[in-house]
C-alpha cells in the first residue's frame, strides 16, 4: 500500500446537476494519518485553490471529513482535500474535477431527408445546452428489422446519416436518444414511408430556344433527375429579365405533372431572360430540388410597340418666306424599341400637298421649311417592321399659340423633381416639357421630354443636380399645333448661398445711411434667396440686425450716431440656410450738410 | 514528554517464542501506531511490522508472516510483539518506535536465542 | 520492496567540516523519507522527515533535501556528537518499510 496519494475523495468523478447541492467525502488512509501524526479535524477543503469556509465541513469520524455545495452554478469546480502537516503546512491529499450540467431534454422536431441519391439524413432540436458531453443516437426500424444505431458526431450533434441504403415504399420508425451522464431522453417516434422524404437531384440540361413565330415566347426543355424512376414530379419554373433581381413564376398549375419541356409565354421581345428550374414528387410530399443552373435566352424582335416622343425647334434668325427647323426625337426604351432601331423615317407635308421623305439614323433632322403649316410624322423601324407614327403639326409663320397650362407648379420630392397643372379645357394631344439650368456662366440648354395628353403631374427623368436652379417650361400641344409655353423655376434641393451679397453705400447722411447691393448671381444662390438681414455696429456698440425682404435692393438706415464709424455686413437666406458677404465700413459726418457748428 | 519503555532483555531457545512489552506514555496512546524494529548485532535497522493502537490494523513484513504477533493493550497504553519459533538468527536488539514517522523510539529489548 | 541505498557506507571528517550523505530509492518514493542518527548500544534518534521536515528539538546544522529518488542529508558545521551512524528509511510503500544500509560517521 502506497502512503502516496495520503487518501482519496468519494466520488472519484462527479457529474452533478447545475444548482443542486452535492456532497464529497475525503477518507485519509490510517498509515498517512500515522505518519503525519493527523486526523480529519486536519483537513482542509479547497475549491480553485480557495479555502472553503469550516462551516461546510463534517466530521464524520477521526478519518473522513465532508464538504458540501449548494446550488451549484460553475460548470468546473476543482475540489481538493488537504492535511495541515508539522504546524501549519498544507500538504495536498487529493484532488478531483466536479463537473456540472444540466441532463438532455427531449429532442424535439425530429425530420428526416433522403437526398437523391444518397443516405437518408435525419437532424433534430436538441434543446437546451447541458454543458456536458451529451451524445445522441438516431434508432430506426421496420416492423420487423432493427437498424445500426446512427451516432451523431461530436461536431453535428443534431444531425446523423445512416449508414444503410434506402428503401422505398417500406414504412420505417425513427426516434432519437439523447444521454449524458445525468440522464437519457427519447424523442417522440416518427413512422414514414422513405418516398415521401425525397429531395431529388435538380433538374440538368436546362437549355433556351426562341420562336422566330412569336416574339413572346421561349420554349425550355431539360433532363429530369434519376428519381423520376421512382416518383412522379412536379416543377418549380422562375424567370427573371437579365439585369432584374426579383423573380416571376410560372403558375404551380401550370407544371403539377412530370415533363421535360415546358413554353414560356407572354415574355417582352427582344428582351434576355434567366430561367431556373426545380422539382419534387407531384404530391408535394417531400423536398424541393435545389435550383438547377441557370439557362439564358432571348425573344425574339417584334417591331417597335409606340412611336417616339417627338418635338421641334425654329430658328429665330429665319430668311425672307424660309425657316430653319430642328425636329428632334428621343431613342425608344428597349422595352419599346422591341429590337435594335435601324433608322428612323421623316415625312414632311406642306398643307395636303407636297410630301418629303426622309430615312435618318440620328435622333435630329434639321430641314428649311416655307411660312406655311406642315404636318412631320415619324417612325422608328427595326428588323421586324415600324413603330405608329408620331404625328407632330408645325403651324404656319403667324400662327398665334394660345391656351397654356394653368397653376403650373414645380417641387423635389423624393429626390425627384416634380412638376404638376391643371389641364386647360381644349383636348391636348400631348405635353412637352423642357428644362434647363439657369447660369450665367453658361447659355441654358435644354432637355426635355414627351408626356401623354391625359398626364397632369409628372417628375423630370433626367440627371439633375443639387443646389442648381432649373428653368421647366411647359407647352400643351394640339391638334392644330403646340399652345403656350409656361415657365417655372425649381431647385431639386437647396442649399444656403456659396457667396452673401457685397453691401455698399449709395448715400450717408449725419443720421442715416442709404445701403445699397446687387442681387446674387444665379450661380451662387443654390435655391431661392427668401429674405436678407442685415447687421451694423459701431466698435463698442451691440451689434443691430435688420430684416429686408429678398425683392429689395437697397435699404436705409436711420436712427444713426453722427461723426461715428459703422462696420455692416449682410447674409441671405434660401430655404437650407444664409450666407454672410464681406463686411464694409463708413463713417457719418459730423454735421449735415448745409449745418454750421 | 513522549516515552516509550521496554520490558528487559530474554534469553530463549530455539523453538521458543519471545513477547517483548512497549509501555507508552505522555501522548494519547490510540491516536498513533507502533512499529517494531530489529537490529542484529554489528548489522544495521529491519522493520518487522506496525499496529494502529486506534483500530488494531496491522501490517507485518513478509520475512515474519505467520511468525510475528503484534497486540496492543489500550487500558495501559501498552503494545506486544511476540515472535514465535526462534532461531538463532533472530538474536538482536528489538526496538518499538512510535508510528510510522519512528519520532520516538523504546530503549530497546536484548533478545537472545541459544542453545 | 523498494531498495535504499546510501552512500558512502563510511567516512572520515573533523569537526567544523561540513558532511553531505545521499540517499538513493530504487523507485519514486515522492518525499516520505526520513533521516536517522544512531550511536553505539543507543536506540536511533529521528532527525528529520518527509525529507526535509527538522524534528523537533533536533539542531539547525541538520538539514534535508531532494523528492522522488534522491535525497540528501546536510550537516553544515559538524560537532564532536555527530559522529555515529546516519539511516535513511522510506514510508512510501508499505509493508515493506525499508532503510538505507547506514553511513558511518568517524573523526578524521
Known amino acids: 500500500e502506497l502512503l502516496d496519494p495520503c487518501g482519496y475523495i468519494s466520488p472519484e468523478s462527479p457529474v452533478v446537476q447545475l444548482h443542486s447541492n452535492f456532497t464529497a467525502v475525503c477518507v485519509l488512509k490510517e498509515k498517512c494519518m500515522d505518519y503525519f501524526h493527523v486526523n480529519a479535524n486536519y483537513i482542509v477543503w479547497k475549491t480553485n485553490h480557495f479555502t472553503i469556509p469550516k462551516e461546510q465541513y463534517t466530521i464524520i469520524n477521526r478519518t473522513a471529513s465532508s464538504v458540501t455545495f449548494t446550488d451549484i452554478s460553475s460548470l468546473n469546480i476543482q475540489l481538493t482535500c488537504n492535511i495541515l502537516t508539522f504546524g501549519q503546512l498544507e500538504q495536498n491529499v487529493y484532488g478531483i474535477t466536479i463537473i456540472s450540467g444540466l441532463p438532455p431534454e427531449k429532442p424535439k422536431n425530429l425530420s428526416c431527408i433522403v437526398n437523391e441519391g444518397k443516405k437518408m439524413r435525419c437532424e433534430w432540436n436538441r434543446g437546451r445546452e447541458t454543458h456536458l458531453e451529451t451524445n445522441f443516437t438516431l434508432k430506426s426500424e421496420w416492423a420487423t428489422h432493427k437498424f445500426a444505431d446512427c451516432k451523431a458526431k461530436r461536431d453535428t450533434p443534431t444531425s446523423c446519416t445512416v449508414d444503410y441504403s434506402t428503401v422505398y415504399f417500406v414504412n420505417i420508425e425513427v426516434w432519437v436518444e439523447a444521454e449524458n451522464a445525468l440522464g437519457k431522453v427519447t424523442s417522440d417516434h416518427i413512422n414514414f414511408d422513405p418516398v415521401y422524404k425525397v429531395k431529388p437531384n435538380p433538374p440538368h440540361n436546362l437549355s433556351v430556344i426562341n420562336s422566330e413565330e412569336l416574339s413572346s415566347i421561349l420554349k425550355l426543355t431539360w433532363t429530369n433527375p434519376s428519381i423520376k424512376s421512382v416518383i412522379r414530379l412536379k416543377y418549380n419554373i422562375q424567370y427573371r429579365t437579365k439585369d432584374a433581381s426579383t423573380w416571376s413564376q410560372i403558375p404551380p398549375e401550370d407544371t403539377a405533372s412530370t415533363r421535360s419541356s415546358f413554353t414560356v409565354q407572354d415574355l417582352k421581345p427582344f428582351t434576355e431572360y434567366v430561367f431556373r428550374i426545380c422539382c419534387m414528387k407531384e404530391d408535394g410530399k417531400g423536398y424541393w430540388s435545389d435550383w438547377s443552373e441557370e439557362a439564358n435566352g432571348i425573344t425574339y424582335e417584334d417591331r417597335p410597340s409606340k412611336a417616339p416622343s417627338f418635338w421641334y425647334k425654329i430658328d429665330p434668325s429665319h430668311a425672307q418666306g424660309y425657316r430653319t427647323v430642328q425636329l428632334m426625337w428621343k431613342t425608344l426604351p428597349p422595352f419599346e424599341a422591341n429590337g435594335k432601331i435601324l433608322d428612323y423615317e421623316v415625312t414632311l407635308t406642306r398643307w395636303k400637298s407636297h410630301l418629303q421623305n426622309y430615312t435618318v439614323n440620328d435622333t435630329k433632322l434639321t430641314v428649311n421649311l416655307t411660312n406655311d403649316r406642315y404636318v412631320a410624322t415619324l417612325t422608328a423601324r427595326n428588323l421586324v417592321g415600324k413603330s405608329d407614327a408620331a404625328v407632330l403639326t408645325i403651324p404656319a409663320c403667324d400662327f398665334q399659340a394660345t391656351h397654356p397650362v394653368m397653376d403650373l407648379k414645380a417641387f423635389p420630392k423624393d429626390n425627384m423633381l416634380w412638376v404638376e397643372w391643371t389641364t386647360p379645357r381644349e383636348s391636348v394631344k400631348k405635353y412637352i416639357l423642357e428644362w434647363c439650368v439657369l447660369s450665367d456662366k453658361a447659355p441654358c440648354i435644354a432637355d426635355w421630354q414627351q408626356e401623354d395628353g391625359t398626364v397632369h403631374r409628372t417628375h423630370l427623368r433626367g440627371n439633375l443636380a443639387e443646389s442648381k436652379c432649373y428653368l421647366i417650361t411647359v407647352t400643351p400641344v394640339y391638334a392644330d399645333g403646340p399652345g403656350s409655353p409656361e415657365s417655372i423655376k425649381a431647385y431639386l434641393k437647396q442649399a444656403p448661398p456659396s457667396k452673401g451679397p457685397t453691401v455698399r453705400t449709395k448715400k450717408v447722411g449725419k443720421n442715416e445711411a442709404v445701403l445699397e447691393w446687387d442681387q446674387l448671381p444665379v450661380d451662387v444662390q443654390n435655391g431661392f434667396i427668401r429674405n436678407y438681414t442685415i447687421f451694423y455696429r459701431t466698435i463698442i456698440g451691440n451689434e443691430t440686425a435688420v430684416n429686408v425682404d429678398s425683392s429689395h435692393t437697397e435699404y436705409t438706415l436711420s436712427s444713426l450716431t453722427s461723426d461715428t464709424l459703422y462696420m455692416v455686413r449682410m447674409a441671405a437666406y434660401t430655404d437650407e440656410g444664409g450666407k454672410d458677404g464681406p463686411e464694409f465700413t463708413f463713417t457719418t459726418p459730423k454735421f449735415a450738410q448745409g449745418e454750421i457748428e | 514528554q513522549v516515552q516509550l519503555v521496554q520490558s528487559g532483555a530474554e534469553v530463549k531457545k530455539p523453538g521458543a517464542s519471545v513477547k517483548v512489552s512497549c509501555k507508552a506514555s505522555?501522548?494519547?496512546?490510540?491516536?498513533?501506531?507502533i512499529s517494531w524494529v530489529r537490529q542484529a548485532p554489528g548489522q544495521g535497522l529491519e522493520w518487522m511490522g506496525w499496529?494502529?493502537?486506534?483500530?488494531?490494523?496491522?501490517d507485518y513484513a513478509q520475512k515474519f508472516q505467520g511468525r510475528v504477533t503484534m497486540t496492543t493493550d489500550t487500558s495501559t497504553s501498552t503494545a506486544y510483539m511476540e515472535l514465535r519459533s526462534l532461531r538463532s538468527d533472530d538474536t538482536a536488539v528489538y526496538y518499538c518506535?512510535?508510528?510510522?514517522?519512528?519520532?520516538?523510539w523504546g530503549q530497546g529489548t536484548l533478545v537472545t536465542v541459544s542453545s | 520492496d523498494i531498495q535504499m541505498t546510501q552512500s558512502p557506507s563510511s567516512l572520515s571528517a573533523s569537526v567544523g567540516d561540513r558532511v553531505t550523505i545521499t540517499c538513493r530509492a530504487s523507485?519514486?518514493?515522492?518525499?516520505?523519507l526520513n533521516w536517522y542518527q544512531q550511536k553505539p548500544g543507543k536506540a536511533p534518534k529521528l532527525l528529520i522527515y518527509?525529507?526535509?521536515s527538522l524534528q523537533s528539538g533536533v539542531p539547525s546544522r541538520f538539514s534535508g533535501s531532494g523528492s522522488g529518488t534522491d535525497f540528501t542529508l546536510t550537516i553544515s558545521s559538524l560537532q564532536p556528537e555527530d559522529f555515529a551512524t546516519y539511516y535513511c528509511?522510506?514510508?512510501?510503500?508499505?509493508?515493506?518499510?525499508?532503510f538505507g544500509q547506514g553511513t558511518r560517521l568517524e573523526i578524521k
Open positions: 518506535a512510535r508510528s510510522l514517522r519512528f519520532d520516538y
Open positions: 505522555g501522548y494519547t496512546f490510540t491516536s498513533l501506531g
Open positions: 499496529i494502529s493502537a486506534y483500530s488494531g490494523n496491522r
Open positions: 523507485q519514486s518514493i515522492s518525499s516520505y
Open positions: 518527509a525529507a526535509s
Open positions: 528509511q522510506q514510508s512510501y510503500s508499505t509493508p515493506p518499510i525499508t
